[in-house]
Amino acid sequence: LGTLPAFLPCELKPHGLVDCNWLFLKSVPRFSAAASCSNITRLSLISNRIHHLHNSDFVHLSNLRQLNLKWNCPPTGLSPLHFSCHMTIEPRTFLAMRTLEELNLSYNGITTVPRLPSSLVNLSLSHTNILVLDANSLAGLYSLRVLFMDGNCYYKNPCTGAVKVTPGALLGLSNLTHLSLKYNNLTKVPRQLPPSLEYLLVSYNLIVKLGPEDLANLTSLRVLDVGGNCRRCDHAPNPCIECGQKSLHLHPETFHHLSHLEGLVLKDSSLHTLNSSWFQGLVNLSVLDLSENFLYESITHTNAFQNLTRLRKLNLSFNYRKKVSFARLHLASSFKNLVSLQELNMNGIFFRLLNKYTLRWLADLPKLHTLHLQMNFINQAQLSIFGTFRALRFVDLSDNRISGPSTLSEATPEEADDAEQEELLSADPHPAPLSTPASKNFMDRCKNFKFTMDLSRNNLVTIKPEMFVNLSRLQCLSLSHNSIAQAVNGSQFLPLTNLQVLDLSHNKLDLYHWKSFSELPQLQALDLSYNSQPFSMKGIGHNFSFVTHLSMLQSLSLAHNDIHTRVSSHLNSNSVRFLDFSGNGMGRMWDEGGLYLHFFQGLSGLLKLDLSQNNLHILRPQNLDNLPKSLKLLSLRDNYLSFFNWTSLSFLPNLEVLDLAGNQLKALTNGTLPNGTLLQKLDVSSNSIVSVVPAFFALAVELKEVNLSHNILKTVDRSWFGPIVMNLTVLDVRSNPLHCACGAAFVDLLLEVQTKVPGLANGVKCGSPGQLQGRSIFAQDLRLCLDEVLSWD
């Protein structure tokens, strides 16, 4: 007999982790004698229903180092149905684990800190009902380095007053380096905290005043977060208590003794001005978050940044004036002193003109590589200014209102009227997600490029070369989600001689000219997905001959354009390696006699082709035969294929990955995978497969991954695979209605390859007989039972 998975109903994962998450357990499982509990160092019991912990629950896990009990008995306000739940923990429950280093009790209805072993290093008590920490709460935890106790008194987990940390309660924790007490209604920073603290997070409390005595003796602090204590509620995505005063009150010497401070968060504090004395002596400050304040005026004349020569990241986002967008904005000259600045976030300050005076003091900063200018209502942008920046690698101008090259005459700062404002009566401070997953993935390839600009989600209708003057250094450009309705003809991007990646998805581009994009000699990746409008104009033809002339192009997306008729009959390119043609009408095109039979054949070096969502109802052998022979990956996912001629895979001698998920295959019949195929991965999940012909997989000797999940299989048979079953690294059979008869052969097979079967312990379930439906195939040992025990359906 094969051995049952040792930690049923849980799953053994790498590095000594037993995963018992989401199993509806009401008690801590007792593992079988065969389970080698001494090797288990991590146990995760997240999101179960364990409401009572006993002294004996963990005695068999003597070497446990990490225990996660999060979300078992959530407090009323955090419970999805607002059930009240009180977790009981017997006094010696955790003391049995003498090696325990990490314990997470978050999201449980506990009111006191249980007794804990002295070995503990990391403790999380967040989103519980613990409202008091005194000297006894954590007595003896001399190894404790990290304590999280967030969210024990706030709108989602309300309490009558506030969390109370008595003075000196944590003083005995001489190794404590991280303390987080966010969302606890604290009105003061607890006094007499251990001087070992390096990270102190007390954001989103009610601490509206901060002075040096609040942080006395905390000379080791490296990160201090006091944000959200005096909020500007007009920018709050959640219930917000208006601050009882006009801003957070900071004593001029609050931080003077914190010479090791590297990160300071003062976000959402209703600050209107910056006092340079706050930052005096912060010689190591490298990250400063001043977002969501009222610093729109202050940043134009402050000298507070004068001495922050080590600052690497500065966040000034959403420092807008309520209901106003400014005509223009000029940063203060003290910005030029930020000689170590690498990243500046100026999203959501709301100004309409971006010209050479806006950011003039940033241009010479030797390390500034990232600049965020999203959501500013910019409608006039002189993009050429970025050509003079010394180190710039990424400028994000997405979600603005740029409609073309800047046409305004250049007002000097002296002439500029900074008070000129425009009322914003319905500015949405919470814009939609910034990019669709597809375009995000496309732009990910720009991470290591020298210079990227994001102009997505603006109001561009036409592209003019003047927009890009002085930007020849640009290697990656996103123009997605605009309204560009142009017939591109090779003159639009002339200055961009080094451009390698261009994202034009979600526009209305008219592709007709053979010279389209020919002005971009270095272009390697081009995204033209979601430009369907021109293709849906009945009677208008489109031409893809431009692809031939892009000699460096490797990646092309024409996805989701509803391309189905009146386009070039061939795509030709020696360079293209990846073509995304998903979301089009190849089904219709291949039905037009032989017109589009050779559509992809001219892509002589193509390695990956995505034909998912192409309304394919039938795939003829000649369709596969006329795909490039170089092809290694073919995706036919989410079509309507009910039949597949498996022997025709021999037409694709280099194919390694075939994705047929989400089709309508009823069976894996019609021959077998052909001899000599190099196929390594086959995904036929989410079909309607009822049966598989014997030896179907047997000849595919390179096969490593097979996904048969979400089908209608009643068994998994060794005969389908032959000896290659032992070569598999993944055999996914989840979500099939397996017939759990006594002596069911699939049990032995799956046990034999159990390390290769995802979710074997719990995700592989019975579909019949009735009493086992929906239960794990190990709910009963099918190898040892008698047939009459299980009634047949």
Epitope: K246, H249, P252
Partner: antibody, heavy 116, light 106 residues
Framework: QVHLQQSGPDLVKPGASVQMSCKTS????????LHWVRQRPGQGLEWIGW????????KYNDQFRGRTTLTADKSSSTAYMFLSSLTSEDSAIYFC?????????WGQGTTLTVSS | DIQMTQSPSSLSASLGGKVTITCKAS??????IAWYQHKPGKGPRLLIH???TLQPGIPSRFSGSGSGRDYSLSISNLEPEDIATYYC????????FGGGTKLEIK
């Protein structure tokens, strides 16, 4: 040395209003709270309220809210307390005091007499 | 609102002697208490803050102690200039003075 200089004594009629001042020196006026405290004859000290000159925020003791207004003039580093609808009950010595947490410096006091 | 009950309201002691004044808060004030000395015609003078921290320039004859709700001010080795009224002040939540203790020398 921090100094808080209060205006001189005042005699006013019931129903009238009064404004007293507290001129500060030798510290940054906008960085600290300025409080007002009352001492009636033969009685103890009562906190009236504070103003934070840095942003003009104010906080009042409930007993004094409505008839009391605290203001500050940054240019002269002077704080003011305005009391209206005076009655004989308002006869007292009024102190101003500087604080961050606790009151560390006090003015000498202004004596207000409300009498017809 | 936090109430501060100070006692005694007056006391008489001998030069060179020691006196203790107490203040009881209506709730835990986490050591946020200050003590003042007040002489007629002047503004009060800060002696102690955060329950036990002596203000610079104040003689060490003055000391403060306590925690939670109960706090005290002690003056040892009494001198003539110690004749004054003494007040406690809680600054944990807004501000409340105790009723005062008038110290006289026998």
């Amino acid at each position: 040395q921090v100094h808080l200089q209060q205006s001189g004594p005042d005699l006013v009629k019931p129903g009238a209003s009064v404004q007293m001042s507290c001129k500060t020196s030798d510290y940054t006026f906008t960085n600290y709270y300025l409080h007002w405290v009352r001492q009636r004859p033969g009685q103890g000290l009562e906190w009236i309220g504070w103003i934070y000159p840095g942003d003009g925020s104010t906080k009042y003791n409930d007993q004094f809210r409505g008839r009391t207004t605290l203001t500050a003039d940054k240019s002269s580093s002077t704080a003011y307390m305005f009391l209206s609808s005076l009655t004989s009950e308002d006869s007292a010595i009024y102190f101003c005091a500087k604080s961050w947490d606790y009151f560390d410096y006090w003015g000498q006091g202004t004596t207000l007499t409300v009498s017809s | 609102d936090i109430q501060m009950t100070q006692s005694p309201s007056s006391l008489s002691a001998s030069l060179g002697g020691k006196v203790t004044i107490t203040c009881k808060a209506s709730q835990d004030i986490d050591n946020y208490i200050a003590w003042y000395q007040h002489k007629p015609g002047k503004g009060p003078r800060l002696l102690i803050h955060y329950a036990s921290t002596l203000q610079p320039g104040i003689p060490s004859r003055f000391s403060g102690s306590g925690s939670g709700r109960d706090y005290s001010l002690s003056i040892s080795n009494l001198e003539p200039e110690d004749i004054a009224t003494y007040y406690c002040l809680q600054y944990d939540d807004l501000y409340t003075f105790g009723g005062g203790t008038k110290l006289e020398i026998k």
